[in-house]
């Protein structure tokens, strides 16, 4: 009898411990919780407000219509200018229009004078085809003007108020673009 | 930091598709875009896709036209449909995070396009 009694308070010492150490991991558990909400909140709380200050377009960026544009301020080839813009969450520049290409021209005379600009075009190895980065055909106004004698991948560049080609491992400035903000107000 | 799970290769014939999918996971508020990268045996890692946090796509010129790359609607898993398959595809694929500050990289996940 006396060894039952010890096996039932063994027992029940053994789920009481079970007990507090689930206690103790639901505090734990809420501590966590709390302080994930607190951070989240400031987060949004940031996000909200900044939204509420910022312009449709990041700092130096340049505002059209839609689009935010990004010149950039260091030369890089092809392939790279591509992975920088999608660190800001964009893209090489893609030309939709010759009024955009006019605006982005007339920008460039503003900011840099003549340079050579990266756009996101590229020529297929195979049909010679130019396609923009996102699968899509160039409107037959904006097909670069020379074609490029490199046995190499030819990429598309802006220069002036011309669109050209030129062998994508060269260095070149490039362009990125998103999209710009809508005001909510 | 962000952690990035990706999932979806194996073996399969030309002409066939495959479906890749990346989660991330960590500090995803940060990530401005996301794309797949492969790797071929004594080849240079090169990008295949990639998708802005606005929904713009990039592709290689070697896979536009098969490849389609997507999100879910919250934006931490990426999706890259390949479909006919050529046996130039097969590498390991990568699926990359870019931050403004810093690039973060998954373990990477076989495709192999052979009959």
């Known amino acids: 009898k006396l060894l039952q009694v010890s096996t039932i308070a063994m027992q029940q010492q053994e789920k009481l411990i079970q007990q507090e150490r689930a206690l103790l991991n639901f505090t734990e558990w809420k501590r966590s919780c709390a302080l994930q909400m607190k951070y989240c909140q400031a987060f949004m709380q940031n996000s909200l407000s900044s939204a509420h200050n910022s312009s449709p377009c990041p700092n130096n960026w340049i505002q059209n219509r839609e689009s935010c544009y990004y010149v950039s301020e260091i030369w890089s080839i092809w392939h790279t200018s591509q992975e920088n813009c999608l660190k800001e969450g964009s893209t090489l520049l893609q030309i939709e229009s010759k009024e955009e290409m006019d605006f982005i021209t007339g920008s460039l005379r503003k900011i840099k004078g003549s340079y050579d600009y990266w756009v996101g075009l590229s020529q297929d190895g195979h049909s010679g085809r130019w396609l923009w980065q996102d699968g899509s055909s160039p409107s037959p106004g904006l097909l670069p003007a020379e074609r490029s004698q490199s046995a190499n991948q030819v990429c598309g560049y802006v220069k002036s108020n011309s669109l050209l080609s030129s062998n994508c491992s060269t260095w070149k400035y490039f362009i990125c673009e998103k999209y710009a903000l809508r005001s909510s107000v | 930091q962000v952690q990035l799970q990706e999932s979806g290769g194996g073996l399969v014939q030309p002409g066939g598709s495959l479906r890749l999918s990346c989660a991330a996971s960590g500090r995803v508020f940060s990530i401005n875009a996301m794309g797949w990268y492969r790797q071929a045996p004594g080849k240079q890692r090169e990008l295949v896709a990639a998708i802005t946090n606005q929904g713009a796509t990039t592709y290689a010129d070697s896979v536009k036209g098969r490849f389609t790359i997507s999100r879910d609607t919250a934006g931490n898993t990426v999706y890259l449909q390949m479909n006919s398959l050529r046996p130039e595809d097969t590498a390991v694929h990568y699926c990359?995070?870019?931050?403004?500050?810093?690039?973060?990289w998954g373990q990477g996940t076989q495709v192999t396009v052979s009959s």
């Open positions: 990359k995070a870019f931050t403004r500050t810093d690039d973060y």
